[in-house]
């Protein structure tokens, strides 16, 4: 699905949100210092705009010296391993002036029995072993240290945790005579956190556990455990939060039922049910307690586990997620889409929207895509005129301002952003789609027709003529 779409910058970018962190002065590991604002009280907005402008213009002077790379550190505790017994690890780029830490969990599906794990090892070894990992990685999207690319948290300490446990970050079993593979996803996160405490995490104010796809589900499964781990280790003041991207799946009925043969065709409930047993998977305590023995698979589904979590979690999910469609056996091949499938797809968006109803911090554009936060152009997509970095900034503010107890949203700073239009790519800021055969970019109208959406059918509920709708879509409105 990677080749089908590209991300492009928009000509007209909204101004970046206010910086949530100022760059520290050289050699000064502080994030704030007292200022006397009495002289500017009457015009604080203007003053702050000037400060921001100054900070942004000075930034390139320091940025030239910056190395964008995150550096690999294999775990010192070599008993915490990838599937094949090689040590797990993490990539780190420190930002000594910052007390913010971003830990990102990589995604990449899963395997749930000996046969499909063997196949995964043959074809995707990087996701099961650390033996061939590069020494460095470049931070992109939310992991970028460039304010232009990452207006949200550019100055944070960045940690990328590669996915090599194939267990949706839930496993707690080591390799043995009996077990051909280790599944230690949950233990890898705990060990990375433990080792990072010795590298500066101990002084953190906020730890944001983020992840995409299987990593996004991993956030939901592990965020409370990380909070508890830090509490037990004597760091109760570190605020632990979660950012789950493209990991909020539905255990809905497949479009066409297929037997559980491989990772892709197996219904998610069945795959996870088998996986938990194979991985010795652990789920959040409070969620597990709600279900009977053998029913813990329920806790892999966002809408079931989310209400049991204590840490604040921001959910990012495309309403028409490609991985969700894949496990539902929906394969958009370029052939015209039959009405039954079109209704199925629209219903999926509706169901997903419904599950986010009580998630105060969420960003769900009506696009057909998968993953967003470590894409370089993650700033492009907007819901109701607000970009994701801006929404995350508002979320930070809401958590800070309300001391986490109040439910009142900040004026002009929304955090619950869920598209309400009903079909894929009805949001004009969606990532551009390419025809998977010709590679040509398609506009929304072309894409919808290509998918077999009859313009009359699409326009009618909006109270529009097909020609009016086409005009609006072409103009990106």
């Amino acid at each position: 699905s990677e080749g089908r779409k590209t991300w492009r910058r928009r000509g007209q970018q909204p101004p970046p949100p206010p910086r949530t962190e100022a760059a520290p002065a050289a050699g000064q590991p502080v994030e704030s210092f007292p200022l006397d604002f009495t002289a500017v009280e009457g015009n604080m907005d203007s003053f702050m705009a000037q400060v921001k402008s100054l900070a942004q213009s000075l930034y390139p002077c320091s940025a030239q010296q910056l190395n964008e790379d995150l550096r690999l550190h294999l775990l010192l505790n070599t008993s915490v391993t990838c599937n094949d017994g090689s040590p797990a690890g993490y990539y780190l780029k420190e930002s000594r002036g910052s007390r913010r830490w971003l830990l990102f969990l990589e995604g990449g599906w899963y395997c749930f029995n000996r046969e499909n794990c063997d196949s995964r090892y043959d074809t995707m070894r990087r996701l099961m072993s650390s033996r061939d990992w590069p020494r460095t990685r470049t931070g992109t999207g939310i992991l970028s240290s460039q304010p232009e690319e990452n207006p949200y948290w550019w100055n944070a300490n960045m940690v990328f945790i590669p996915y090599c446990s194939s267990d949706v970050w839930s496993g707690a079993s080591s390799k043995s005579e009996k077990n051909e593979y280790a599944f230690m996803g949950a233990l890898i996160i705990q060990e990375v956190v433990r080792e990072l405490l010795g590298r500066g995490l101990s002084g953190a104010k906020v730890l944001l556990l983020a992840g995409s796809s299987a990593g996004g589900t991993g956030v939901l499964l592990n965020v409370d455990r990380v909070a508890e781990q830090l509490e037990k280790l004597g760091y109760p003041a570190i605020q632990v939060r979660g950012l789950a991207d493209s990991g909020w799946f539905l255990d809905n009925k497949q479009y066409r039922h297929t037997d559980c043969v491989d990772t892709i065709t197996c219904a998610p409930t069945e795959a996870i049910r088998r996986g938990i047993r194979y991985w010795n998977g652990v789920v959040p305590e409070r969620c597990r307690r709600q279900f009977q023995e053998g029913e813990e698979w329920n806790c892999f589904f966002g809408y079931k586990v989310y209400p049991t979590l204590r840490c604040p979690v921001f959910v990012v999910q495309w309403l028409f997620d490609e991985a969700q469609l894949t496990v539902d056996n929906v394969h958009l091949t370029g052939q015209p889409v039959q009405e039954g499938l079109r209704l199925y797809i629209q219903n999926l968006g509706r169901e997903l929207r419904h599950t986010l109803k009580d998630v105060p911090a969420s960003f769900a554009p009506a696009c057909l895509s998968h993953e967003i936060i470590i894409r370089s152009h993650w700033t492009d997509v907007q819901v109701k005129g607000t970009s994701l970095p801006r929404a995350l900034h508002c979320w930070d503010r809401s958590l800070h301002d309300s001391h986490k107890a109040s439910k009142t949203p900040l004026k002009g700073c929304p955090v619950h952003l869920v598209d309400s239009c009903p079909w894929p790519h009805c949001n004009p800021s969606c990532p551009t789609v390419r025809d998977q055969f010709t590679g040509q970019e398609m506009n929304v109208a072309q894409f919808l027709m290509h998918m077999g959406f009859d313009m009359q059918t699409v326009a009618q509920p909006q109270g529009l003529e097909p020609s009016e709708l086409l005009g609006m879509l072409s103009n990106g409105s």
Epitope: E231, P236, N280, V282, R286, R289, Q290, E293, P307, A405
Partner: antibody
Framework: QVQLLQPGSVLVRPGASVKLSCKAS????????MHWVKRRPGQGLEWIGE????????TYNEKFKGKATLTVDTSSSTAYVDLSSLTSEDSAVYSC?????????????WGQGTLVTVSA | DIMMSQSPSSLAVSVGEKVTLSCKSS????????????VAWYQQKPGQSPKVLIY???TRESGVPDRFTGSGSGTDFTLTISSVKAEDLAVYHC?????????FGGGTKLEIK
């Protein structure tokens, strides 16, 4: 040190409601679930439910749904249980309790309990 | 709901004696993923609130005398007092925190002869 303070006793009429309080001190109130337990002589202990003060989320024992409502006031670090439509069966000692850690609920800290007597 | 049954409901012992209190659950309280038994034991002295003695079936709470020992796994659990003292006069409760709703046993009343 952790303290959970509860009033000693309250007398209520059948059919009435009562709101019992539990004032917490010595720890960050919003970071731990607060539990309520009912104690009747000769009948052992019954778990009523729990509330997470940070976001107001609750889990109830089905048996007490409709009878007990858990709330908190974070500004005063106080948890409450509201008991409605009281009958003699509700006469008991009601205690608040807190776990040692966030997620594992054996009860390391207990309030002294409030004796509720339902009598005409 | 998981039922917790304690036996005996009461017993009288002499100071210095060894006592064994039993608690049985209607389903296993051992979680295979972490190999822990989700059982706690409490002591409730007359006119006082319960006080935790043991959690994870066998971990002694700090400050609890070592004459108190918890054991067992799955569905059968035991609290042993190796040499009873007069101050051990109390009701002893077991509790499961494995599944909602949390449930307690009916209690065992320990009296001193």
């Amino acid at each position: 040190q952790v303290q959970l303070l509860q009033p000693g006793s309250v007398l209520v009429r059948p059919g009435a409601s009562v709101k019992l309080s539990c004032k917490a001190s010595g720890y960050t109130f919003t970071s731990y679930w607060m539990h309520w337990v009912k104690r009747r002589p000769g009948q052992g202990l019954e778990w009523i439910g729990e509330i997470y003060p940070n976001n107001g989320r609750t889990t109830y024992n089905e048996k007490f749904k409709g009878k007990a409502t858990l709330t908190v006031d974070t500004s005063s670090s106080t948890a409450y249980v509201d008991l409605s439509s009281l009958t003699s069966e509700d006469s008991a000692v009601y205690s608040c309790a807190r776990g040692l850690y966030y997620d594992y609920d054996w009860f390391a800290y207990w309030g002294q309990g409030t004796l509720v007597t339902v009598s005409a | 709901d998981i039922m917790m049954s304690q036996s005996p409901s009461s017993l009288a012992v002499s100071v210095g004696e060894k006592v064994t209190l039993s608690c049985k659950s209607s389903q296993s309280l051992l979680y295979s993923s972490n190999q822990k038994n989700y059982v706690a034991w409490y002591q409730q002295k007359p006119g006082q609130s319960p006080k935790v003695l043991i959690y994870w079936a066998s971990t002694r709470e700090s400050g609890v005398p070592d004459r108190f020992t918890g054991s067992g796994s799955g569905t059968d659990f035991t609290l042993t007092i190796s040499s009873v003292k007069a101050e051990d006069l109390a009701v002893y409760h077991c509790q499961q925190y494995y599944r909602y709703p949390y449930t307690f046993g009916g209690g065992t009343k320990l009296e001193i002869k």
